[in-house]
């Protein structure tokens, strides 16, 4: 014959472990229900009776089965340089994301605390190696032959144009300046970009004390341009 | 864009009812919250209650549990604050508000009032 | 319940003053769950700072919130004619959700 079922609450046989989506609670000494995300445990189980569980909260939120007396506090607001890329909802956190322009200069547990703007390399400087969602612009001088005339957190060093007669010759700043005569060969016009960083999505973690309902706003201050590297501005 | 409209102004007697509307439109009703509050000539404002429109769960200041029911029906957007045994001290401009989940119950919209007077 | 005091009740300033409105809560309330509107007469509040320090899409940047705890405050660094009104704290942190009395702003 099949093993009856048992319905929560009931005794584990000894040496057994209760079955998914069911906890042990050590006071009742009975295997009782989880709460299913987006709630919490508002009384926890008897001999008799089973858990009863409620809804999150307001700014409240619970991802997985649980039964926690009280759900966890959604993070704060997504500050001015960030974007929120998921909504605190009650089965899941707020998460904030660094705005274009800006990398994690603070990570935390999922995502980032605080925002800080890419690093802008000065004319005569380019961009060595890119921002990315966690670390900032490396600008490096322009090489011989090379300039960058603008500021830039994304464009690289180009190549001076390269000219039959050459009117005024070209500096790390600035590209040559050629006769009347077409040069030989010119380098495209435009500036080369390099792609923006994907910011990575974030999320707080912290119950706050006896949550009541909640809407969000955040802890995170933009932070001002990073002091100028060499051959940087933080305009 | 986000409105919250109610219905206008009431002239009751002492221990009749009322119920006053909120008609929202330009948003999603799902995940806010519909919140009364009331004030008296003169005086500041005062939390009545809440209503989840998704779920129809309600949370009164304990003061207000007997004394008003709030209701919503989500097929026509609309939130509905009945005040019962109406007195004099019932005389105010009831508003409805709304927070959105996650906004730690910032009231963002409200709606223009209403004025509800109570005299025999 | 959680009690919000404000004060002053009232207060008279000129135009260009810096002006600190306080809002003392009667026990601890999470910063995110502390709220300030403004109110003209006749008119609807308006939601003026959020999550203590947060200002909402058209609120003038003269306006700041700061605090923790039990102490908030609502400052206007320079007083214009237009911020002549009520300002109302509002604790959003434990249930029933109360509002300070209300402070007036009047012109001098």
């Known amino acids: 014959l099949p093993a009856q079922v048992a319905f929560t609450p009931y005794a584990p046989e000894p040496g057994s472990t209760c079955r998914l989506r069911e906890y042990y609670d050590q006071t009742a000494q009975m295997c009782c229900s989880k709460c299913s995300p987006g709630q919490h445990a508002k009384v926890f189980c008897t001999k008799t009776s089973d858990t009863v569980c409620d809804s999150c909260e307001d700014s409240t939120y619970t991802q997985l089965w649980n039964w926690v007396p009280e759900c966890l506090s959604c993070g704060s607001r997504c500050s001015s340089d960030q974007v929120e890329t998921q909504a605190c909802t009650r089965e899941q956190n707020r998460i904030c994301t660094c705005r274009p322009g800006w990398y994690c200069a603070l990570s935390k547990q999922e995502g980032c605390r605080l925002c800080a703007p890419l690093r802008k390399c000065r004319p005569g400087f380019g961009v060595a190696r890119p921002g990315t969602e966690t670390s900032d612009v490396v600008c490096k001088p322009c090489a011989p032959g090379t300039f960058s005339n603008t500021t830039s957190s994304t464009d690289i060093c180009r190549p001076h144009q390269i000219c039959n007669v050459v009117a005024i010759p070209g500096n790390a700043s600035m590209d040559a300046v050629c006769t009347s005569t077409s040069p030989t060969r010119s380098m495209a016009p435009g500036a080369v970009h390099l792609p923006q960083p994907v910011s990575t999505r974030s999320q707080h973690t912290q119950p706050t004390p006896e949550p009541s309902t909640a809407p969000s706003t955040s802890f995170l201050l933009p932070m001002g341009p990073s002091p100028p590297a060499e051959g940087s501005t933080g305009d | 864009q986000v409105q919250l409209v109610q219905s206008g102004s009431e002239l009751k007697k002492p221990g009749a009812s009322v119920k006053v509307s909120c008609k929202a439109s330009?948003?999603?009703?799902?995940?806010?919250?519909m919140h009364w509050v009331r004030q008296a000539p003169g005086q500041g404002l005062e939390w009545m209650g809440r209503i989840d429109p998704a779920t129809g769960n309600t949370k009164h200041d304990p003061k207000f549990q007997d004394k008003a029911v709030l209701s919503s029906d989500t097929s026509v957007s609309t939130a509905y604050l009945q005040i019962s045994s109406l007195k004099a001290e019932d005389t105010a401009v009831y508003y409805c508000a709304r927070s959105p989940y996650g906004d730690f119950g910032a009231m963002d919209y409200w709606g223009q009032g209403t004025l509800v007077t109570v005299s025999s | 319940d959680i009690q919000m005091t404000q004060s002053p009740s009232s207060l008279s300033a000129s135009v260009g003053d810096r002006v600190t409105i306080t809002c003392t809560a009667s026990s601890s309330v999470s910063s995110n769950y502390l709220h300030w509107y403004q109110q003209k007469p006749g008119k609807a509040p308006k939601l003026w700072i959020y999550?203590?320090?947060n200002l909402p899409s058209g609120v003038p940047s003269r306006f700041s919130g700061s605090g923790s705890g039990t102490d908030f405050t609502l400052t206007i660094s320079s007083l214009q004619p237009e911020d002549f009104a009520t300002y109302y704290c509002?604790?959003?942190?434990?249930?029933?959700?109360?509002f300070g009395q209300g402070t007036k702003v009047e012109i001098k």
């Open positions: 330009g948003f999603n009703n799902k995940d806010i919250y």
């Open positions: 509002h604790q959003y942190h434990r249930s029933p959700w109360t």
């Open positions: 999550s203590t320090s």
